[in-house]
């Protein structure tokens, strides 16, 4: 994906993220030279968070609320750089891109990983899922690959039908673009595919984190 805009407001932090940050700072003060065993540290953090009272968590929740307000305030005045329009128009009626075999696998096992390791960051959950997938024998991957292939087939039929009808957005604007070469089009679609999957996973994780905060 493109390089981030340095002027873009920093993303908002959850109450748990503030708590972990505080944990890290405490750990650094106590053991300035010690290297952190990430999984042990995450485990301890999440155990501590689970045993904390609502009153103790309150401080971090206040920090998260303040940070959310800061983020919303900054986003109101933030102007994205030229060419970085929020996202190219996506017709909500367009067929949804099919997930890859790995994405199907992740959807199946992400809840388990997140549930058993509540302190793991989104990146580390993804890393763990990647390890699980890589350690999976080829014949164990087959059901996911079969399902992904079926969904891809269905998508290709649906997208062909959708294109035959003509994109409503293009029709409205009267835009007539020369057909890109099939190869280029497919490459772009694959790239978009991966971006969509990553975005969907991030959105899912963010939603789940917010749900966790509500608990």
């Amino acid at each position: 994906m493109g390089k981030g805009d340095p002027k873009k407001p920093r993303g908002k932090m959850s109450s748990y993220a503030f708590f972990v940050q505080t944990c890290r700072e405490e750990h650094k003060k106590k053991h300035p030279d010690a290297s952190v065993n990430f999984s042990e540290f995450s485990k301890k953090c999440s155990e501590r968070w689970k045993t904390m009272s609502a009153k103790e968590k309150g401080k971090f929740e206040d920090m998260a609320k303040a940070d959310k307000a800061r983020y919303e305030r900054e986003m109101k005045t933030y102007i994205p750089p030229k060419g970085e329009t929020k996202k190219k128009f996506k017709d909500p009626n367009a067929p949804k891109r099919p997930p890859s075999a790995f994405f199907l696998f992740c959807s199946e096992y992400r809840p388990k990983i997140k549930g058993e390791h509540p302190g793991l960051s989104i990146g580390d959950v993804a890393k763990k899922l990647g390890e699980m997938w890589n350690n999976t024998a080829a014949d164990d991957k087959q059901p996911y690959e079969k399902k992904a292939a079926k969904l891809k087939e269905k998508y290709e039929k649906d997208i062909a039908a959708y294109r035959a009808k003509g994109k409503p957005d293009a029709a409205k604007k009267g835009v007539v673009k020369a057909e890109k070469s099939k190869k280029k089009k497919e490459e772009e679609e694959d790239e978009e595919d991966e971006e969509d999957e990553e975005e969907e996973e991030d959105e899912e994780d963010e939603d789940e984190e917010e749900d966790d905060d509500d608990e």
Epitope: E108, P111, K112, E116, M132, T136, D140, P143, Y144
Partner: antibody, heavy 117, light 110 residues
Framework: EVQLLESGGGLVQPGGSLRLSCAAS????????MTWVRQAPGKGLEWVSS????????KYADSVKGRFTISRDNSKNTLYLQMNSLRAEDTAVYYC??????????WGKGTTVTVSS | DIQMTQSPGTLSLSPGEGATLSCRAS???????LAWYQQKPGQAPRLLIY???KRATGTPARFSGSGSGTDFTLSISSLEPEDFAVYYC???????????FGQGTKVEVK
């Protein structure tokens, strides 16, 4: 406390059907793969079938393929095994089991299925 | 399909003695997917060792697992009365699981 409780076993005639259930409690059922393992009298352990957390993916031992169907109802925290065209060799204690992190397996006490005329 | 063969079928030993149980796979398997179970009469199996050599929660230190490729071993350094049981090796495929068990080794009192 994590618990798995099998039920539905009994005496059935060859060619008959039976549906086993396994009620789970004490853990988030919808996160985990679930598995049926059986043990014929005086014999060893035999893996029967497994199902993924969402229920979207299943696997079967060759000996039961086409006759047994594994399913789950995550809203009821229950695992099922529908057994059709039962044979004498399906006589066994059927265990329901799941596996947590670090391979900590949890097993039920088992339910006995007897196929006999 | 991978077959798991255990030997001996029965092991007659006295408390305090050491025990060595063998498990052979019909083709090379990753140690990540090799486990050992203990089963006592009338009880469900209990996981002892996973990933060929890691002790599961609650497994006493006298139990140890080793091996790689096709040959794996479960060792009991000094048998306690509660260790007399049947032991199964297991090869596991995951997501969702598919398990292959050996036929078992019975450890009985001599």
């Amino acid at each position: 406390e994590v618990q798995l409780l099998e039920s539905g076993g009994g005496l059935v005639q060859p060619g008959g059907s039976l549906r086993l259930s396994c009620a789970a409690s004490g853990f988030t059922f919808s996160w985990y793969d679930m598995t049926w393992v059986r043990q014929a009298p005086g014999k060893g352990l035999e893996w029967v079938s497994s199902i993924s957390p969402s229920g979207g993916y299943t696997k079967y031992a060759d000996s039961v393929k086409g006759r047994f169907t594994i399913s789950r109802d995550n809203s009821k925290n229950t695992l099922y095994l529908q057994m059709n065209s039962l044979r004498a060799e399906d006589t066994a204690v059927y265990y329901c089991t799941t596996e947590f992190y670090d391979y900590l397996d949890v097993w039920g006490k088992g339910t006995t299925v007897t196929v006999s005329s | 399909d991978i077959q798991m063969t255990q030997s001996p079928g029965t092991l007659s030993l006295s408390p305090g003695e050491g025990a060595t149980l063998s498990c052979r796979a019909s083709q090379s398997v990753s140690s990540t997917y090799l486990a050992w179970y203990q089963q006592k009469p009338g009880q469900a199996p209990r996981l002892l060792i996973y990933e060929a050599s890691k002790r599961a929660t609650g497994t006493p230190a006298r139990f140890s697992g080793s091996g790689s490729g096709t040959d794996f071993t479960l060792s009991i350094s000094s048998l306690e009365p509660e260790d007399f049981a049947v032991y199964y090796c297991q090869h596991r495929h995951n997501w969702p699981p598919q398990w292959t068990f050996g036929q078992g080794t019975k450890v009985e009192v001599k």
